[in-house]
Interface confidence: low
């Protein structure tokens, strides 16, 4: 009679996570008489999957009834597949022995692929906010997919970016991986309604591709503009000071009057005004009675953006002339060490 | 117990090729990363590359243009070829397994074999 | 490259007291998932290299609770609570975050 000959038709089955694998095996005669074993991997590292004879395999159930007399159908169905189920399957069949039963034949193994789907994509950016024109890096993490091919891209307001770097983990086999990718993003006055976007596409999300996103309004700061303007007179001895603090993000900000160097008022950007591309204006004013001064006065409008170093400007407010004929001074004065002179 | 055990030339001329090899008992290759790293007399240790046990190879960029290391699964063995050696590539070479199961990174380098001495010398 | 750096160079130890080595990297060994691929090893003299700790304080299989290894992102350290004569050798550190893996230069412990 011809040789016991163990049957793995399947080279390869692939399953997605969550789902339920069928391993197939069957053998071409009863005897030799003895238990059949399902193992993953080969030789002594191997690890029992299910074990005919003997064992409890609670996700393991068998596709047909194996207490039958003449059953040459071993396959098997492993429940609620992960990627950690991964591997080669061999179906082996023992020799009823004394004491022990002794391994006979083996199939040629069965290889378990596992898909799982990449967890949705986290993009996070820079700790500190940055200013326009400034280059800030945006990291995006994936995890739990498998297999490993697996596409990314970045998206600045749908426009693709190019300057990123991406690495997929670990560099070798795994049950699963994940991805990292670090992208370079300019920033620009506009980008306070900006999105970054990190697009990943993978074989176990049929074409519809998860995305994560972060708002450039987290990350951004627009220092304002600062312009002082005198107006007309409204009483006898009294001019109105204007500082209108422009485009500036976040809100945060406090604002000083000085006359000749000394604090007249300090206020917080309360009522601003929002700009189309989200920035903000504001306007302060201040009320000089000039004839409390003998001499001329200097107003200062301060202002202390989001924590930053102080911006200031400037108006020289000439007591001996007329209110109405007093122009606007446009030399800037910058008491900030890190900011560069606002016009 | 897996153990590790190289074996090849003590001796290796100038400009010739190292080769060694290293055979893997009690234990099976598959799931770990199999390593060869080397310390010359006196020295610290160098990490000259591994490879995994689907084939994939991965090498110290300062070596990387003179090394192989190779695999067969069927002789539990893995082995290194090091070309146009000088005398500074004298050096005692350990074969290792190094771990991998926690995602990106390595476990440990838990099994070392005893190290064979490769002199390099006219 | 990850470049380790390790001090002391040397420690002379007395038995049954504490020591402490320091290992630094060049850049941070802690992934997003929690791990730091720190290891750290034991070479006796005219031995091979022994694991002690890895992912930064893990525990290696048969290592002695003596041993134990804390620190997370460039600065790490082993410690020994109670030294033992056999603890003598050099103790290297390695990163295992990236290839190529790289090891701090060694610290030479020895008794006084």
């Known amino acids: 009679e011809e040789e016991l000959q163990v049957i793995q038709p399947d080279k390869s089955v692939l399953v997605a996570a969550g789902e339920t694998a069928t391993l197939r095996c069957t053998a071409t005669s009863l005897i030799p008489v003895g238990p059949i074993q399902w193992f993953r991997g080969a030789g002594p590292g191997r690890e029992l999957i299910y074990n005919q004879k003997e064992g409890h395999f609670p996700r393991v159930t068998t596709v047909s009834d194996l207490t039958k007399r003449n059953n040459m159908d071993f396959s098997i169905r492993i429940g609620n597949i992960t990627p950690a189920d991964a591997g080669t399957y061999y179906c082996v069949k023992f020799r009823k022995g004394s004491p022990d039963d002794v391994e006979f034949k083996s199939g040629a193994g069965t290889e378990l692929s596992v898909r799982a789907k990449p967890s949705a994509p986290v993009v996070s950016g820079p700790a500190a906010r940055a200013t326009p024109q400034h280059t800030v890096s945006f990291t995006c993490e994936s995890h739990g997919f498998s297999p490993r091919d697996i596409t990314l891209k970045w998206f600045k307001n749908g426009n693709e970016l190019s300057d990123f770097q991406t690495n997929v983990d670990p560099v070798g086999e795994s049950v699963s991986y994940s991805i990292h990718s670090t992208a370079k993003v300019v920033l620009t006055r506009e980008d306070v309604h900006s999105q970054v976007i990190c697009e990943v596409a993978h074989v176990t999300l049929q074409g519809d591709p998860l995305r994560g996103t972060a708002n450039l309004s987290e990350t951004i700061r627009v220092p304002p503009t600062l312009e002082v303007t005198q107006q007309p007179v409204r009483a006898e001895n009294q001019v109105n000071v204007t500082c209108q603090v422009r485009k500036f993000y976040p809100q945060r900000l406090q604002l000083t009057w000085l006359e000749n160097g000394n604090v007249s008022r300090t206020e917080t950007a309360s009522t601003v005004t929002e700009n189309k591309d989200g920035t903000y204006n504001w306007m302060s004013w201040l009320l000089v009675n000039v004839s409390a001064h003998r001499d001329d006065v200097k107003l200062t409008c301060q202002v202390e953006h989001d924590g930053q170093p102080a911006v200031s400007k400037s108006h020289d407010l000439k007591v001996s002339a007329h209110p109405k004929e007093q122009g606007s001074n446009t030399a800037a004065e910058n008491t900030g060490s890190n900011e560069r002179n606002i016009y | 117990q897996v153990q590790l055990q190289e074996s090849g030339p003590g001796l290796v001329r100038p400009s010739e090729t190292l080769s060694l090899t290293c055979t893997v008992s009690?234990?099976?290759?598959?799931?770990?990363?199999w390593s060869w790293i080397r310390q010359p007399p006196g020295k610290g240790l160098e990490w000259i590359g591994f490879i995994y046990y689907n084939g994939r190879t991965f090498y110290n960029p300062s070596l990387k243009s003179r090394v192989t290391i190779s695999l067969d699964t069927s002789k539990n063995q893995f082995s290194l070829k090091m070309t146009s050696v000088t005398a500074a590539d004298t050096a005692v070479y350990y074969c290792a397994r190094v771990r991998a199961y926690s995602g990106i990174g390595l476990d440990g380098t838990d099994v070392w074999g005893q190290g064979t001495t490769v002199t390099v010398s006219s | 490259d990850i470049v380790m750096t390790q001090s002391p160079l040397s420690l002379p130890v007395t038995p049954g007291e504490p020591a402490s080595i320091s290992c630094k990297s060049s850049?941070?060994?802690?992934?997003?998932?929690?791990?730091?691929?720190l290891d750290w090893y034991l070479q006796r003299p005219g031995q091979s290299p022994q694991l002690l700790i890895y992912q930064g304080s893990n525990r290696a299989s048969g290592v002695p609770d003596r041993f134990s290894g804390s620190g997370s992102g460039t600065d790490f350290t082993l410690k020994i609570s109670r030294v033992e004569a056999e603890d003598v050798g050099v103790f290297y550190c390695m990163q295992a975050l990236q290839t190529p893996l790289t090891f701090g230069g060694g610290t030479k412990v020895e008794i006084k």
């Open positions: 009690g234990g099976s290759i598959r799931n770990y990363y």
């Open positions: 850049q941070s060994l802690l992934y997003s998932n929690g791990y730091a691929y």
